[in-house]
């Protein structure tokens, strides 16, 4: 079982390989000096049907380096960064993992593209392995709350409350959504 020639790349090179390309072979892409690699640099020859070989993902692309490009902080609710830090320049990558009791959908890594957007795929999502969710928490008088997403919230996520200036927060500042679908505490109040 073998794979066909790896997909070509403009303004870059493909690592050495011999033919036939055996299942298990890895080929790696790199870009010329003034270009930046967007996407996974390593492709793996696999077989899905034990008959034909295929590459496990699309080839990355080489974008002409844009020194003015910068990307915003990428947010994945229920997830956290395991690699990458601000500022995010053209060609920089960020890799995510999901919090406990969350599973990932999509690709764990994204790259800062010349158009100031993360790509070449969408940001991954972290989905709660528990079907239960906590109901949306109310806003509080003279205060605010921040949550990682709107509406009902998956277990493992939290909401942080704060009070307007001149008001004191009474109760729990951070309330966690438990795996039972219940909140760890009642909302606090803001008192003068």
């Amino acid at each position: 079982i073998s794979c066909g020639s790896p997909p070509p790349i403009l303004n870059g090179r493909i690592s050495y390989y011999s033919t036939p390309i055996a299942v298990g072979t890895v080929i790696r892409y790199s870009c010329s000096g003034t270009f930046r690699l967007i996407g996974e640099k390593s492709l793996l020859c696999i077989t899905k049907d034990k008959v034909d070989g295929t590459w496990d993902k699309p080839a990355p692309k080489c974008e002409y380096f844009n020194k003015y490009s910068s990307c915003p902080e990428p947010i994945v609710p229920g997830g956290y960064k395991i690699r990458g830090s601000t500022p995010y320049r053209h060609g920089d990558s960020v890799t995510f993992a999901c919090k406990t009791n969350f599973s990932m959908n999509g690709n764990k890594s994204v790259w800062c593209q010349a158009n100031n957007m993360w790509g070449p795929t969408r940001l991954p999502t972290c989905v709660s392995v528990f079907p239960l969710e906590c109901p949306a928490l109310p806003m509080i008088h003279n205060g605010h709350h921040t949550s990682e997403n709107v509406g009902s919230i998956a277990p493992g996520l939290s909401v942080t409350y704060s009070c307007e200036s001149g008001y004191l927060l009474v109760g729990e500042k951070i309330i966690n959504c438990l795996s039972s679908g219940k909140w760890s505490a009642v909302p606090p109040t803001c008192e003068e």
Partner: antibody
């Protein structure tokens, strides 16, 4: 950090086989490749082959083709390396080493297993 | 197979000084090169990957450079714990290691 724990030292007769295990803990066994690298006494490092457990795909260095078999048991997060038709020059420390995804370099290594081939 | 050649075989340097280790590939390997440190009785430890990226927890005194066929590992100010054997490894086409450079105290 992933920890790789290998089986203990072995003494074997020429012509026999040896099977060394490497148990991984921490991380996701399915998200990495395990290579086997050996080091003869006072010598350098020599790559023997590697397996991608999630796919069950194993590839071997030409020198060891037909004599080495690398397998993995996903249920126990354990990789195995079996070397057959042993000869005295196979006396070495055998290491398992982990590469994240298919990065090509080894972030974590087992402690090594000394295999002595002697009549 | 891609043959990796390290030089010198042995390097004698005084603590506090700079050490420069070389690795040459038999054909272009782009930047697909890693450096490892090995002390007696221990497994190798990853220092540098992709020719110049420091692995997690590796001190800043270790740096890597080069691309194509010529690569260098530099240790800017040698500490006592740095005296060991250093190996380069390519991953352009499968995997192969250099024969090692022994860094010893002068």
């Amino acid at each position: 950090q992933v920890q790789l724990v290998q089986s203990g030292a072995e003494v074997k007769k020429p012509g026999s086989s040896v099977k060394v295990s490497c148990k991984a803990s921490g991380g996701t066994f399915s998200s990495y490749a395990i290579s086997w690298v050996r080091q003869a006494p006072g010598q350098g490092l020599e790559w023997m082959g590697r397996i991608i457990p999630i796919l069950g795909i194993a590839n071997y260095a030409q020198k060891f083709q037909g004599r080495v078999t690398i397998t993995a048991d996903k249920s126990t997060s354990t990789a195995y390396m079996e070397l057959s038709s042993l000869r005295s020059e196979d006396t070495a420390v055998y290491y398992c080493a982990r590469e994240e995804d298919i990065s090509g370099y080894y972030q974590d290594w087992g402690q090594g297993t000394l295999v002595t081939v002697s009549s | 197979d891609i043959v990796m050649t390290q030089s010198p075989a042995t390097l004698s340097v005084s603590p506090g000084e700079r050490a420069t280790l070389s690795c040459r590939a038999g054909q272009s390997i782009s930047s697909y090169l890693a450096w490892y440190q090995q002390k007696p009785g221990q497994a190798p430890r990853l220092l540098i990957y992709d020719a110049s990226s420091r692995a997690t927890g590796i001190p800043a005194r270790f740096s890597g450079s080069g691309s194509g066929t010529e690569f260098t590992l530099t240790i800017s100010s040698l500490q006592s714990e740095d005296f060991a054997v250093y190996y380069c490894q390519q991953y352009e086409y499968w995997y192969s290691f250099g024969q090692g450079t022994k860094l010893e105290i002068k």
